[in-house]
Interface confidence: low
């Protein structure tokens, strides 16, 4: 837009120069014509004026077609003095001042139009700039807003995790305390009874049970890996959560399958048991029959 401004100013200057030049031409013509015969001079001046106007109109038309001219130099006027101007009848006098005034008015109007167009463009550009600034500001505000929300959410999430951790730890401690209390109560009972055999039996039993529990713990430990999540970022945590969810989903499916299998096996055992019972009944009956037969 700065370049446009410069070009426009240049064009304005050029037009002013052209106007001044024309004025000088007319003034020169007037001086010459005063010296020459009045009628001829008037006719000649009018013809030259007409030609000058035609020349300029042609030039303007060309400029309108080709767009603004690269070179800003004023073009030389080409008058044709060898052509004989038409005679103006006596009594008709050309008003040079009027022609000049109209000419100046036309130039001034054009200039005014150019200036207005220039300022209109400038105003539009300024408005666009303001609008752009507004939008940039707004985006900045929106992004800050989104960032603030994200930070809030992150804080909430961290708090939730912290609460969850605290709750788990508390539960763990409570369970430990409960186990310790039970063990103590059990040990007190054993000491109080003083039955060595019973104690030995109990120890054997509890030892056996302990082994089963150990087995269970071992299996669970293998399945339940340590949840090291402190170093993970939000996306990784989300992935981890999905992973855990999937493993729970798989375990549930596995559990369901095992339960179904267990039901099936239970059913089969019952079928077999019934079959055995039936066989036993049959064999008992047969046995009795044989004996009876023998004793008879």
């Amino acid at each position: 837009s700065d370049i446009e401004e410069v070009v426009e100013e240049y064009e304005e200057e050029e037009q002013e120069e052209a106007a001044v030049e024309e004025e000088e031409d007319w003034r020169e013509d007037e001086d010459e014509q005063e010296e020459a015969a009045e009628e001829d001079a008037e006719a000649e001046a009018e013809t030259e004026e007409t030609r000058a106007e035609e020349d300029e109109e042609e030039e303007e038309a060309k400029e309108a077609e080709d767009g603004p001219m690269e070179e800003s130099k004023p073009k030389p006027r080409s008058f044709m003095p060898n052509l004989v101007p038409p005679k103006i009848p006596d009594g008709e006098r050309v008003d040079f001042d009027d022609i000049h005034r109209k000419r100046m008015e036309k130039d001034l109007n054009e200039l005014q139009a150019l200036i207005e167009a220039h300022f209109e463009n400038r105003k539009k550009e300024e408005e666009e700039l303001v609008s752009l600034k507004d939008r940039i500001e707004r985006r900045r505000a929106e992004r800050a807003e989104q960032q603030r929300i994200r930070n809030e959410r992150e804080k909430e999430r961290q708090n939730r995790l912290a609460e969850e951790r605290a709750r788990r730890e508390e539960e763990e401690n409570r369970r430990k305390a409960e186990d310790a209390r039970k063990k103590k109560a059990l040990s007190n009972m054993m000491h109080f009874g003083g039955y060595i055999q019973k104690q030995a039996q109990t120890e054997r039993k509890s030892g056996k049970r302990q082994t089963e529990r150990e087995k269970k713990k071992k299996i669970l430990a293998e399945r339940r890996k340590v949840l090291a999540i402190d170093h993970l970022n939000e996306d990784q945590l989300r992935e981890k959560a999905k992973e855990l969810w999937q493993s729970i989903y798989n375990l549930e499916a596995e559990k369901f399958d095992l339960q179904e299998k267990f039901k099936q096996q239970k059913y089969e055992i019952n079928v077999l048991r019934n079959r055995i019972n039936d066989n036993q009944k049959v064999s008992k009956t047969r046995g009795k029959a044989k004996v009876t037969g023998r004793w008879k």
Epitope: D134, R135, R138, A141, E142, R143, E145, Q146, I149, R150, D235, R238
Partner: antibody, heavy 114, light 111 residues
């Protein structure tokens, strides 16, 4: 709890104008832009514009620039949208929303019919 | 304006299966490492409800079976396993550039 309570349904004649409201509660009204969204029957959603409750600064979707005028009243934590030169094309559900479309009003149904 | 094209327009998924909705933007909605893409769920007679913000961040209180992914111009919303209550219309929406625009919507039915 963030809540946006919108004014009731409107039935207006073509050529008339209408002004609907959206009363905010449960948060600091000036903290977030108030957004307005149009949903024509069975169609998708269109963003109309935003207003900054702090200074009344507005941002419009060019499509609605001559149709909607957004204003706010800080004292009552209420945002307003005026729709002018109504035609049947303006019949729709209009929602207000805030905090980057996080919370929404229940919507105001506008019916333009002669 | 950024045009968001959602596909498919409607989708029927069996209970417990996976539903995937795609959203393509006519130009990138990324800015400074963040994708400004949101996903909404809308049930009949209710306002939209935001499920996902910034392409993959789950809104608090939204079940983990909803997930979003993508960046630049290609985004997707996944629901797995689909539940009865997920029957609704889903919209993607970009908030990276004025005017904010929404996708045409995808209607999800549960078989």
């Amino acid at each position: 709890e963030v809540q946006l309570q919108q004014s009731g349904p409107e039935l207006v004649k073509p050529g008339a104008s209408v002004k609907m409201s959206c009363k905010a509660s449960g948060y600091t009204f000036t903290d977030y832009y108030m957004k307005w969204v149009k949903q024509s029957h069975g169609k998708s959603l269109e963003w109309i514009g935003d207003i900054n409750p702090n200074n009344g600064e507005t941002f419009y979707n060019q499509k609605f620039k001559d149709k909607a005028t957004l204003t706010v009243d800080k004292s009552s934590s209420t945002a307003y949208m005026q729709l002018n030169s109504l035609t049947s094309e303006d019949s729709a559900v209009y929602y207000c929303a805030t905090r980057v479309f996080d919370f929404w009003g229940q919507g105001t149904t506008l019916t333009v019919s002669s | 304006d950024i045009v968001l094209t959602q596909s498919p327009a409607s989708l029927a998924v069996s209970l417990g299966q996976r539903a995937t909705i795609s959203c393509k933007a006519s130009q990138s909605v990324d800015y400074d490492g963040t994708s400004y893409m949101n996903w909404f769920q809308q049930k009949a007679g209710q306002p939209p409800k935001r499920l996902i913000y910034a392409a993959s961040n789950l809104e608090s209180g939204i079940p983990a079976r909803f997930s979003g992914r993508g960046s630049g111009t290609d985004f997707a919303l996944n629901i797995h396993p689909v539940e009865e209550e997920d029957a609704a219309t889903y919209y993607c929406q970009q908030s990276n550039e004025d005017p904010y625009t929404f996708g045409g919507g995808t209607k999800l039915e549960i078989k």
